[in-house]
């Protein structure tokens, strides 16, 4: 079996002129292609892998949401020579908000890594964006994490930073077929320069208070001291697929396949930092 082979990070790697073909090892009878698109409120980008696969032919599409970071994963396996070039790898640039006053900044600023390399997304070097509230959701937290796509015995990963709906999530993640989007949230402007070592403590957990020793009493009893339950510890969330995971498209839509005449089917594309208006 002969398959197309490439690895795309953001918009580099699977451009048409860079396409390779590979002969699969004996016993390998499917070609695979996987595309993972991530959308923040300031832009989107995609990861993609093509190569010799494993398993059975078929399709698997999944939509995911991590605190307002949207992901759309498409996995396709096929059993013909060079059949693995059907998915569109282009991330659409998000339409700028038509009426900027409809989405005024909410006062929070975050570092934004949308399709940036790991080198460009270090510390305080990435661009800073102003958060805004969109789609009836409040984006007042900042996020620092990673997206990883694994297919055809290849793993490709990129950092993700931006505005999210949660200010206190810790090492949270969502997963799809061969795909993981994970990271932590924080409160306060530009707080997401590095959340890799964030602990589980958050302002919602009451501080530990040293209680004074109990007053001496003549009644012999076992004194038990408990902290108030009025501020429960917020459980960390686990994988949370959207209600309808199959063929779910992020708000702006990730195009399934471009037409032969109109669009270059295989161009890579990382979106610019543009606001989405829906």
């Amino acid at each position: 079996l002969e398959c197309y082979s490439c690895v795309q990070k953001a918009d580099d790697g699977c451009s048409p002129n860079k396409m390779k073909t590979v002969k699969c090892a004996p016993g390998v009878d499917v070609c695979t292609e996987a595309v993972g698109a991530v959308e923040t409120i300031h832009g989107q980008f995609s990861l993609a892998v093509r190569g010799c696969g494993s398993g059975l032919p078929g399709k698997n599409d999944r939509g995911l949401d991590l605190h307002g970071l949207l992901a759309f994963i498409q996995l396709q396996q096929c059993a013909q020579d060079r059949c693995n070039a059907k998915l569109n790898l282009t991330s659409r640039a998000l339409d700028p908000a038509g009426n900027e006053s409809a989405y005024p900044p909410n006062g929070v600023e975050c570092y934004s890594c949308v399709g940036l390399s790991r080198e460009a997304c270090q510390g305080t070097s990435p661009p800073v964006v102003s958060c805004y509230n969109a789609s009836d959701h409040v984006y007042k937290g900042c996020f620092d994490g990673n997206v990883t796509l694994t297919a055809a015995n290849v793993t490709v990963s990129l950092p993700v930073r931006g505005c999210v709906q949660d200010e206190f999530c810790t090492r949270d993640g969502v997963t799809g077929p061969g795909f993981t989007l994970s990271g932590s949230c924080c409160q306060g402007s530009r707080c997401n320069s590095d959340l890799r070592n964030k602990t589980y403590f958050s302002p919602r957990i009451p501080p530990l208070v040293r209680l004074p020793p109990p007053e001496p009493t003549t009644v012999a009893s076992t004194t038990s001291v408990t902290t108030s339950t009025s501020a429960p510890v917020r459980p960390t969330s686990t994988t949370k697929p959207m209600p309808a995971p199959t063929s779910q498209t992020p708000r702006q839509g990730v195009e399934h396949e471009a037409s032969r005449d109109e669009e270059p089917r295989l161009t890579g594309g990382a979106a610019g930092h543009q606001d989405r208006s829906n």
């Epitope: 918009d11 002129n17 590979v22 161009t267 594309g269």
Partner: antibody
Framework: EVQLLESGGGLVQPGGSLRLSCAAS????????MSWVRQAPGKGLEWVSY????????YYADSVKGRFTISRDNSKNTLYLQMNSLRAEDTAVYYC??????????WGQGTLVTVTS | QSVLTQPPSASGTPGQRVTISCSGS?????????VHWYQQLPGTAPKLLIY???KRPSGVPDRFSGSKSGTSASLAISGLRSEDEADYYC???????????FGGGTKLTVLG
């Protein structure tokens, strides 16, 4: 119908500068990788520079590195090539080309750049 | 000197079959990158003739075919016609140069 229309070519002295433009229509420009390819008089094709759909990934041929700058304005559906420190050997017809199905599937008609003293 | 090597000229009579070779190296064709062929008629811009080693864009007659093996590729034109008189270029990505490279071009002459 896909159309690519180059402009900005002309006569320039060695060491001078020119800015070429390529106006695109008939396709979603913001989704397409684009390139400049040149052809010296009576010679073969030589790839010059390459820009990704968003403009964040750029490649240059060694012969123009540090002198030429490729850029794009997706809102205007236009590709640019800023050429500085021009040399006699840069004299050529400059084509803008779209990367479509695996290859450069559409080409403009070209604009002639002549570098001479 | 081009990275991909083509014969400078080729010729044939109408109806004949002509083959144009394109020789590369381990950093381009030999690395697995697909090969494309372009046709440039006199005084016009190049036109995509064959992409992805052996596929024809719509509108290209099936008289044109491409193949690839190891570090080389070839373009075959059967049933040669006078309108096939043109320059033909092969192209592929090159890892060392980090960009697409072209062959030097082959001028095809249709005799008689």
């Amino acid at each position: 119908e896909v159309q690519l229309l180059e402009s900005g070519g002309g006569l320039v002295q060695p060491g001078g500068s020119l800015r070429l433009s390529c106006a695109a229509s008939g396709f979603t420009f913001s989704n397409a990788w684009m390139s400049w390819v040149r052809q010296a008089p009576g010679k073969g094709l030589e790839w010059v520079s390459y820009i990704s759909s968003s403009g964040s990934t750029i490649y240059y041929a060694d012969s123009v590195k540090g002198r030429f700058t490729i850029s794009r304005d997706n809102s205007k559906n236009t590709l640019y090539l800023q050429m500085n420190s021009l040399r006699a050997e840069d004299t050529a017809v400059y084509y803008c080309a779209r990367e479509g199905l695996w290859a450069f599937d559409y080409w403009g008609q070209g604009t002639l750049v002549t570098v001479t003293s | 000197q081009s990275v991909l090597t083509q014969p400078p000229s080729a010729s044939g009579t109408p109806g004949q079959r002509v083959t144009i070779s394109c020789s590369g190296s381990s950093s381009n064709i030999g690395a697995g990158y697909v090969v494309h062929w372009y046709q440039q008629l006199p005084g016009t811009a190049p036109k995509l003739l064959i992409y992805d080693n052996n596929k024809r864009p719509s509108g290209v007659p099936d008289r044109f075919s491409g193949s690839k093996s190891g570090t080389s590729a070839s373009l075959a034109i059967s049933g040669l016609r006078s309108e096939d008189e043109a320059d033909y270029y092969c192209a592929a990505w090159d890892d060392r140069l980090n960009g697409p490279v072209f062959g030097g071009g082959t001028k095809l002459t249709v005799l008689g």
